[in-house]
């Protein structure tokens, strides 16, 4: 599948997941907390203030780093999965905190969490998985 299609498909799936999560959690535009979002890399579910959300590294990094091994399972496609089964000490896990000021930046940043190798196939086609 062409990279743009994968990108758009993941984004569309994310927006659907967020909508379902909003319904489940009773979230609306005026609710306190952090709205679910697609950050152009991965999908973040809505969260209450004080909540830390954990996600597995997105598929993007598996393409950049095919030899990278993650100890955590991928979050399911049909929902946000059980983030309780993820641990920040695991390689391949990224977190964001929901604060009264909104979402924090990812911790660790994606490259550090997901084992990005900047010298891997610098001109290879996989550059364009998301980056085209």
């Amino acid at each position: 599948m062409h990279s743009d299609c994968i990108f758009k498909k993941e984004q569309a799936m994310c927006l659907e997941k967020i909508q379902r999560a909003n319904e489940l959690m009773g979230f609306n535009d005026s609710s306190p907390g952090c709205p679910g979002m697609w950050d152009n890399i991965t999908c973040w579910k809505p969260a209450h203030v004080g909540e830390m959300v954990l996600v597995s590294c997105p598929e993007l990094f598996r393409i950049f780093n095919p030899d990278q091994v993650w100890e955590t399972e991928t979050i399911g496609e049909s929902d946000f999965g059980d983030s309780n089964s993820l641990d920040l000490s695991d390689m391949g896990v990224v977190s964001r905190n929901c604060t009264e000021d909104g979402w924090s930046e990812p911790f660790p940043h994606y490259f550090d969490a997901c084992g990005f190798d900047e010298y891997e196939s610098e001109t290879g086609d996989q550059d364009y998985y998301y980056l085209s």
Partner: antibody, heavy 120, light 107 residues
């Protein structure tokens, strides 16, 4: 090796505009976020702006919001900072730095800077 | 925005002595706190990432600790080339910010 070379600095009058450039080499530019950080003479570092790998996300310090615009041309491996309505307090050495991430990251490699002097 | 405060502003020490630099954040930044060294006429250099993670090429005498709002950079035994200005930087919340710096000079 990673190399970042800033250009476009100079002396400019208050209220005028200037565009800084940063030429990147030694890494896959299109995969990395990029930052601008400035340093007034004899002062500390001040974070100015960051742009994500594809230019889709841009964030600014309050002191420059609405006046400065960060942009990039991945086909030319070049980062830009368009500075409008310049003030005396914008006088500084402007560094471009690579962000170690797709989205923002922390600056890990820095250029040598280009000096902007705002004076009448 | 998150304000970073560094202390002391200046630290006067002799080569071989231990340097302890402090950085305090106005709100929790978790461990998204990084340390930079800047020598006169040079660009900053990344020393420590995520409060305590060392980087290749950085001497082992540099170490970091802390989380939340209080962080420390320690130089176990100062070498002549370590006399410089040190900045902390948070990448937890936008807009990102730097501390005002601590100058380590020769006593």
């Amino acid at each position: 090796q990673v190399q970042l070379v800033e250009s476009g600095g100079g002396v400019v009058q208050p209220g005028r505009s200037l565009r800084l450039s940063c030429a990147a080499s030694g890494f896959t530019f299109s995969r990395f976020a990029m930052h601008w950080v400035r340093q007034a003479p004899g002062k500390g570092l001040e974070w100015v702006a960051v742009i994500s790998y594809d230019g889709g996300n841009k964030y600014y310090a309050e002191s420059v919001k609405g006046r400065f615009t960060i942009s990039r041309d991945n086909s030319k491996n070049t980062l830009y900072l368009q500075m409008n309505s310049l003030r005396a307090e914008d006088t500084a050495l402007f560094y471009c730095a690579r962000g170690y991430d797709f989205l923002t990251g922390y600056p890990d490699y820095w250029g040598q800077g280009t000096l902007v002097t705002v004076s009448s | 925005e998150i304000v970073l405060t560094q202390s002391p502003a200046t630290l006067s020490l002799s080569p071989g002595e231990r340097a302890t630099l402090s950085c305090r954040a106005s709100k929790s930044v978790g461990r998204s706190l990084h340390w930079y060294q800047q020598k006169p006429g040079q660009a900053p250099r990344l020393l420590i990432k995520y409060a305590s993670q060392s980087l290749s090429g950085i001497p082992a005498r540099f170490s970091g600790s802390g989380s939340g709002t209080d962080f420390t950079l320690t130089i176990s035994s100062l070498e002549p080339e370590d006399f410089a200005v040190y900045y902390c930087h948070q990448s937890s919340r936008l807009p990102f910010t730097f501390g005002p710096g601590t100058k380590v000079d020769i006593k």
